[in-house]
Interface confidence: low
């Protein structure tokens, strides 16, 4: 078997580093190479080099190593900037504990347990010895440092400068002692670089033995520098990948610090009634999932099997079955008590209004002048200067640029619903803040709702209660399904994008969804020539209480006879009163024996004033909603709907112009349904179709 | 399109030797790992053995170690797999596979060669 | 080394039926799991990668889920075409190791 001794997990790195000697006594060697592998296998073997290597810097320009005998913390040394180069300081020479017997032990420690001063290794007074440096090439037996040349059992000794006491122990921390972290580690930034059973850790920058995800450069804010232990993706504590080929990763042990409490910068913000971004901080005692199923005991592993438990992650509160969020997760969550469904988000618990005196903004925002500098789902907003690019790409005018300082929330695209930033998340290229509108600003982002003054034309489940069958050209219907049971709506408006309701995501698994398209029954029975079925890869929720969702497509869909996509209307668009319109959806019918048949009820537009008297004046409708009535009475959209789409015609045009959501009754007699109105959104719609990446077909 | 094709399998003696070949095309050979992995007739795979895109790394299972060496040649956008002191028990296809770097996430073989018969009887 | 076991060995199954096939890994793997699929007389397809990520091209019938020791591939619907053996391939560490197979058979 033929591998090459790799030693660079035996370094510490420093990026765009390297060291100057001031003193010009000190050596130096330097050689061509390829790599910073090879001047560390070099510089641990000391192969060719006057002197024992404590440090190298690899010249990337150049292709160059610079060995050193010395390291930043030496004497005579300075350390410099330079994008060229990165400095490798042997971790043996720097470390300030003792890993296992600390055989390998090189640091500066002179003073024994009692302490007494070492005697220099070199010499024979007061003690005579055979532990001399010659004899003991490679132990590093420097000056009068403690040193466990043999590897014995106490640990790094010294003979003493005491003519009475022979030798002694140095009192030198095991490196697990001294290493400490709060909680499950997530923010540790130690220097432990081995795994619980010894085994060396694997640096995050190498591909070697272990190829894996966690590149540094993916991910700068996880602390992946050299080989140390991390905890990147909420295990219960650190871990990294090892050196063992056969063994791909294993936990590291750090104990857990005295004073167990995480730094300021680390704590999310505690609240009991809303949750703050993410929801990390809920302390909460909702203990149901949205839609009303009681959760499971997170330190119960019936009738779900995990390993969330309050043990595995100290810090998270999991206490009794209350909703939290222990793993970065989009929003509190929990483990549910129907043996059918593994876990559900508890997205019934409201949004904080982050709104704190001044922050706060008129209009749709875009004077707004304050320092916030984080997205709604708790990302750190990133510079605007690195994203002109990309903001030139979705706005056909030159951007205020004076307004776009450092990372500040803005709103430099007038986006009719508030200051936003982009992230640097690749998933989540851009995303709002959380700022709101000022109290008693009323000013509308869009006029003159009941008269038609922009055309809508250019343009998906609730059940539909009492509808017609229907089979002619209903292609942008998508049944979306749950544990595969359809379980809502929606409407195809983009080959990759379906617009839906968010309330239509029990769980926090996309792998529990699938988007069926090109079906008339809601089994696919008869279907199978035309159905396509496409799985769920992403879910980018709309503006703050729009409960819109655009849900991407793991692949585009095909479109053919039995697939197609629907309009959106424009931006800000009215449609006239008594405008016929349809909405359509699989949900139970109202008829004993349903034939699982996509349904359509007709009915037509009523103004937002109408709207409400219909409603006994209990609902105020606002520019985001749209109101539309049945012709017949009892016809309309009911639960199984939710997400499914109010489909209008102008001038000769199908539109969506509304989403069935939740919350407003179920075809009520001279109840008319109140929609999430499309046009107020289409804006937010276009810009995430045009700024978040999507699978080529 | 990636393209695997394996040669030199054969019936051989017990004790013999071997040198299959796997041909490579349709993508940058050099950048990707490669493995040798076997299948006896009618039984499970088995993965034989590993080398990373340079050569500098190579991993064989326990039942071949000793015998077998494998090695490749960039300019040729070939690899190979010598196999020693063969056994009746190392009768398989011998698969050349593909394994894919899937944008830094770890180890798995997207494309597989037709396979080459390796035969060990006297 | 890491024993995978797969089960059962073999399934008769019809078009249309739902199919389940588990792998069990002597000792915890995170995600690291693969799929495959393999016809007679020809070379395995990899379905899955990463325990639940669909391999590009693989239909979407097919899902992956698990993670530790217990591993499962669906065929949610079966297809003509999906009569096969199917191995699941651990990722953890040297040596990588593949289930016996579970032969999936018309009914």
């Known amino acids: 078997q033929r591998k090459r001794r790799n030693t660079i997990h035996e370094f510490k790195k420093s990026a765009k580093t390297t060291l100057i000697k001031i003193d010009p006594a000190l050596k130096i060697k330097t050689k061509k190479v390829n790599t910073a592998d090879q001047c560390a296998n070099r510089c641990t073997r000391n192969k060719g080099l006057p002197f024992t290597c404590k440090a190298f810097v690899f010249d990337k320009a150049r292709k160059q190593c610079l060995w050193f005998p010395f390291n930043s913390m030496s004497s005579g040394v300075k350390k410099e900037f330079g994008h060229e180069f990165d400095l490798y300081e042997n971790k043996d020479y720097i470390r300030n504990c003792i890993i296992g017997k600390g055989r390998s032990y090189k640091g500066t420690v002179s003073i024994t347990k009692s302490g007494i001063k070492c005697q220099p290794w070199s010499s024979m007074i007061p003690h005579e010895h055979s532990f001399l440096p010659s004899s003991y090439r490679g132990k590093d037996l420097q000056e009068n440092y403690c040193r466990n040349p043999r590897g014995e059992e106490g640990g790094p000794w010294c003979f003493t400068s005491n003519p009475e006491v022979r030798y002694e122990v140095c009192d030198i921390p095991q490196c697990s002692e001294v290493e400490c972290m709060t909680c499950n580690g997530e923010s540790y930034r130690g220097l432990m670089d081995h795994t619980e059973s010894g085994k060396i850790c694997q640096r995050w920058d190498h591909q070697t033995p272990h190829r894996h995800k966690f590149l540094p450069e993916r991910y700068p804010d996880k602390g992946f520098d050299d080989n140390y232990c991390r905890n990147p993706d909420g295990q219960p504590r650190p871990w990294c990948y090892t050196l063992d080929p056969h063994t791909r990763w294993e936990y590291c042990a750090i104990k857990t610090c005295a004073d167990n409490t995480m730094n300021d910068t680390d704590v999310p913000l505690e609240t009991t009634e809303c949750i703050q971004g993410q929801g990390e901080g809920y302390r909460g005692t909702v203990n149901t999932i949205w839609n009303g199923i009681p959760c499971q005991r997170w330190d119960s592993q019936y009738p779900h099997e995990h390993d969330m438990t309050p043990e595995n992650f100290k810090c998270k509160d999991l206490r009794e079955n209350y909703c939290r969020n222990p793993d970065g997760s989009e929003s509190p969550w929990c483990f549910t008590t129907d043996p059918n469904i593994r876990v559900g988000y508890c997205s019934q618990i409201p949004n904080c209004d982050m709104s704190h005196g001044q922050d706060c903004y008129r209009g749709n925002g875009k004077n707004y002048m304050g320092n916030l500098s984080q997205t709604r789902s708790g990302l750190t907003c990133s510079m605007w200067d690195k994203n002109m690019e990309d903001l030139h790409r979705h706005i056909f005018w030159e951007p205020d640029a004076s307004k776009l300082n450092e990372n500040y929330c803005r709103n430099p695209d007038d986006d009719a619903h508030g200051p936003w930033c982009y992230t640097g998340n690749p998933l989540i290229p851009w995303d709002y803040c959380p700022i709101s509108r000022c109290e008693g600003d009323t000013t509308p982002t869009i006029v003159n709702l009941d008269h038609p003054v922009i055309s809508c034309a250019k343009t998906k489940q609730l059940r539909v209660v009492n509808g017609i069958p229907t089979r002619t050209n209903i292609g942008w219907m998508v049944s979306l399904r749950y544990r595969n049971k359809h379980i809502c709506g929606g409407s195809l408006i983009k080959e990759s994008w379906v617009l839906t309701a968010r309330q239509c995501f029990p769980s926090r698994d996309l792998k529990d969804y699938e988007a069926w398209l090109g079906i008339h029954d809601v089994h696919g029975r008869g279907d199978e020539k035309c159905k396509q079925v496409l799985n769920v890869s992403q879910l980018v929720y709309g503006p703050e209480g729009s409960d819109l969702v655009l849900m991407k497509l793991a692949r585009p869909a095909v479109l053919d006879d039995f697939v197609s996509t629907i309009d959106l209307p424009n931006y800000g668009c009215t449609i006239p009163e008594k405008t016929s319109c349809s909405v359509y959806g699989w949900g139970y019918t109202g008829l004993i024996n349903y034939d699982g048949l996509l349904r359509v009820a007709h009915l037509y537009i009523m103004g937002n004033e109408k709207c409400s008297q219909h409603h006994r004046g209990k609902v105020t409708l606002n520019e985001s909603e749209i109101c539309a009535g049945a012709e017949k009475i009892g016809s309309g959209p009911c639960e199984g709907d939710y997400g499914g789409p109010l489909v209008c015609e102008q001038h000769k045009m199908r539109m969506v112009l509304g989403v069935i959501v939740p919350g407003r009754g179920c075809a009520i007699p001279n109840r008319p349904g109140i929609f999430v109105r499309v046009a107020y959104y289409a804006k937010w719609i276009h810009k995430i179709i045009l700024t978040y990446k999507v699978p080529q077909s | 399109q990636v393209q695997l094709v394996e040669s030199g399998g054969g019936l051989v003696k017990p004790g013999g030797s071997l040198r299959l070949s796997c041909a490579a095309s349709?993508?940058?050979?050099?950048?990707?790992?490669m493995s040798w992995i076997r299948q006896a007739p009618g039984k499970g795979l088995e993965w034989v053995s590993y080398?990373?895109?340079?050569?500098?790394?190579?991993y064989y299972a326990d039942s071949v170690k000793g015998r077998f060496t494998i090695s490749r040649d960039n300019a040729k956008n070939s690899l190979y797999l010598q196999m020693n002191s063969l056994r009746a028990e190392d009768t398989a296809v011998y698969y050349c596979?593909?394994?894919?770097?899937?944008?830094?996430?770890?180890?798995?073989?997207?494309?597989w060669g037709q396979g080459t018969l390796v035969t060990v009887s006297s | 080394d890491i024993q995978m076991t797969q089960s059962p060995s073999s399934v008769s199954a019809s078009v249309g039926d739902r199919v389940t096939i588990t792998c069990r890994a002597s000792?915890?793997?995170?995600?690291?799991l693969a799929w495959y699929q393999q016809k007679p007389g020809k070379a395995p397809n990899l379905l899955i990668y990463?325990?639940?990520s669909l391999q590009s091209g693989v239909p979407s019938r097919f899902g992956g889920s698990g993670s530790g020791t217990d591993f499962t591939l669906t065929i949610s619907s079966l297809q003509p075409e999906d009569f096969a053996t199917y191995y699941c391939?651990?990722?953890?560490?040297?040596?990588?190791?593949f289930g016996q197979g579970t032969k999936v058979e018309i009914k």
């Open positions: 596979a593909r394994d894919e770097y899937n944008s830094g996430w770890y180890v798995l073989f997207d494309y």
């Open positions: 000792q915890g793997i995170s995600s690291w």
């Open positions: 080398i990373s895109s340079s050569g500098s790394t190579i």
């Open positions: 349709g993508f940058t050979f050099s950048d990707y790992y």
């Open positions: 391939q651990q990722a953890n560490g040297f040596p990588w190791t």
């Open positions: 990463e325990a639940s």
